[in-house]
């Protein structure tokens, strides 16, 4: 029960995280105009990964896309790449984790397969979260560097008579959304990995009958192994790792990867 809860919670947390990463990637407010020097500006600038916008006091907002690929800073391209990789990995992770959920039955998928899928999706979520955190952090570092560079030469003028105020940019809402979303995806991934340990069988899964030599009541059956593999006579042998929950009749009639040692 605890394993199912951990897995389910990990899935939900990761889902929220990935939705946040997608939202952050699409948001225009990665960097916003610093209003420290002019808190009553009539023109407000903000920029995203894909376009830059200007919101005027009149209420008019104008956005222009970055229609060049080669002309963009390498750092911005790197951030874009990290965020997209994070989204793609997260999306694949979500798809895998849906099939891995213990509460969802798909055919007669074994717990070991679900455990492997849970681990895979968990790792994907962890990497996805790390990509988002890295992308946002790289952008934030770029902003901090540019902020102090523009502060150093904030005012340039002709003999000090005419001032040209350089627009400085500070952290936008998208950065915080990205950090939180990346963190959530990472936490969700860790939870999935923890859930995987609980899903995995404790001992090696031999699909064979147990032979008890202690009592005279139990006879030696040569067809026992054949029955256990699903190829021989259909004797009602129980799976030892399953606590006797299902008979071999209910198990798939083809050999699985655990049938041969």
């Amino acid at each position: 029960m605890a394993v199912t809860a951990c897995q389910g919670l990990g899935f939900v947390v990761s889902l929220i995280g990935i939705a946040g990463i997608i939202a952050a990637t699409c948001m225009d407010q990665w960097s916003t105009q610093d209003l420290y020097n002019n808190p009553v500006t009539a023109v407000f600038n903000y920029q995203g990964l894909w376009r830059s916008c200007v919101r005027e006091s009149s209420g008019f907002t104008e956005c222009r896309g970055y229609f060049t690929l080669l002309g963009l800073p390498a750092m911005l391209q790197a951030v874009r790449a990290l965020m997209i990789v994070g989204i793609v990995l997260g999306a694949i992770g979500l798809l895998v984790s849906i099939f891995a959920l213990k509460c969802i039955r798909i055919g007669s998928m074994e717990d070991s397969a679900k455990a492997n899928m849970t681990l895979t999706s968990g790792i994907m979520f962890i990497v996805s979260g790390l990509c988002a955190i890295a992308g946002v952090s790289v952008f934030a570092n770029m902003l901090v560097t540019n902020f102090w560079m523009s502060t150093a030469n904030m005012y340039t003028g002709m003999g000090g008579m005419v001032q040209t105020v350089q627009t400085r940019y500070t952290f936008g809402a998208a950065l915080f959304v990205g950090w939180v979303a990346g963190g959530l995806t990472l936490i969700g991934g860790v939870m999935m990995c923890i859930a995987c340990r609980g899903l995995a069988p404790e001992e090696t899964n031999y699909k064979a009958v147990s032979y008890h030599a202690s009592g005279h009541s139990v006879a030696y059956k040569p067809g026992g192994f054949k029955a256990s593999t699903g190829f021989g006579s259909n004797t009602k042998n129980k799976k030892i790792y399953d606590g006797g929950a299902r008979t071999e009749d209910e198990v798939q009639s083809y050999p699985s990867k655990h049938d041969y040692v």
């Epitope: 105009q33 500006t41 009539a42 023109v43 200007v54 009149s58 008019f60 222009r64 001032q163």
Partner: antibody, heavy 120, light 112 residues
Framework: EVMLVESGGGLVKPGGSLKLSCVAS????????MSWVRQTPEKRLEWVAT????????YYVDSVKGRFTISRDKAKNTLYLQMSSLRSEDTALYYC?????????????WGQGTSVTVSS | DIVMTQSPSSLSVSAGEKVTMSCKSS????????????LAWYQQKPGQPPKLLIY???TRESGVPDRFTGSGSGTDFTLTISSVQAEDLAVYYC?????????FGAGTKLEL
């Protein structure tokens, strides 16, 4: 047709109060940023206050801060300028103006103005 | 505050003449975000409210004759009337639309 009609001006003693009104018609009043601009007897134009549609932010020229309040009644399509602690330098013709949505914050429509005289 | 300085304060012209008036701002009105200049020109005739002629330093407002041309960028701006008509006799004001307070120039009076 866009129309802005100001009213409420008059003669007032220094330290007194006055409330100017501007009734708007011919456009979606709530979607536009509105301003008050005054013209002094020397014919100088001075921006007084702005009520922006962006977050409902209000802006004032330093000389009227704390004394004047700009507000609007969307239901009545009316812009107001509440003036208190009036001084002689507040004597002017007060215009109500609309900031155009695609005019780079420029005021595309103006009212005919209402005269305010502050004198003892 | 951004100070707007207009010159000359008055200008005597003859009909058909080309007129140029200047407006200088103490700070750049060019926004780096969209590379647009936030400067407007207004025309005010006696007994009338100001009328918007030019916004964004060079864009003519609809209905404004094409003899009116705005130019300039950053801190230096110009309003040119290619061929002055009798109805153009008025006071012309430039205005900073970039930063609050939205300051106006003192005006340039165009007279015959």
């Amino acid at each position: 047709e866009v129309m802005l009609v100001e009213s409420g001006g008059g003669l007032v003693k220094p330290g007194g109060s006055l409330k100017l009104s501007c009734v708007a018609s011919g456009f979606t009043f709530s979607s536009y940023t509105m301003s008050w601009v005054r013209q002094t007897p020397e014919k100088r134009l001075e921006w007084v206050a702005t009520l922006s549609v962006v977050g409902g932010n209000t802006y004032y020229v330093d000389s009227v801060k704390g004394r004047f309040t700009i507000s609007r009644d969307k239901a009545k399509n009316t812009l107001y300028l509440q003036m208190s602690s009036l001084r002689s330098e507040d004597t002017a013709l007060y215009y109500c103006a609309r900031l155009g949505q695609t005019q780079r914050n420029a005021m595309d429509y103006w009212g005919q103005g209402t005269s305010v005289t502050v004198s003892s | 505050d951004i100070v707007m300085t207009q010159s000359p304060s008055s200008l005597s012209v003859s009909a058909g003449e080309k007129v140029t008036m200047s407006c200088k701002s103490s700070q750049s009105l060019l926004n780096s975000g969209n590379q647009k200049n936030y400067l407007a020109w207004y025309q005010q005739k006696p007994g009338q409210p100001p009328k918007l002629l030019i916004y964004g330093a060079s864009t003519r407002e609809s209905g404004v004759p094409d003899r009116f041309t705005g130019s300039g960028s950053g801190t230096d701006f110009t309003l040119t009337i290619s061929s002055v008509q009798a109805e153009d006799l008025a006071v012309y004001y430039c205005q900073n639309d970039y930063s609050y307070p939205l300051t106006f120039g003192a005006g340039t009076k165009l007279e015959l």
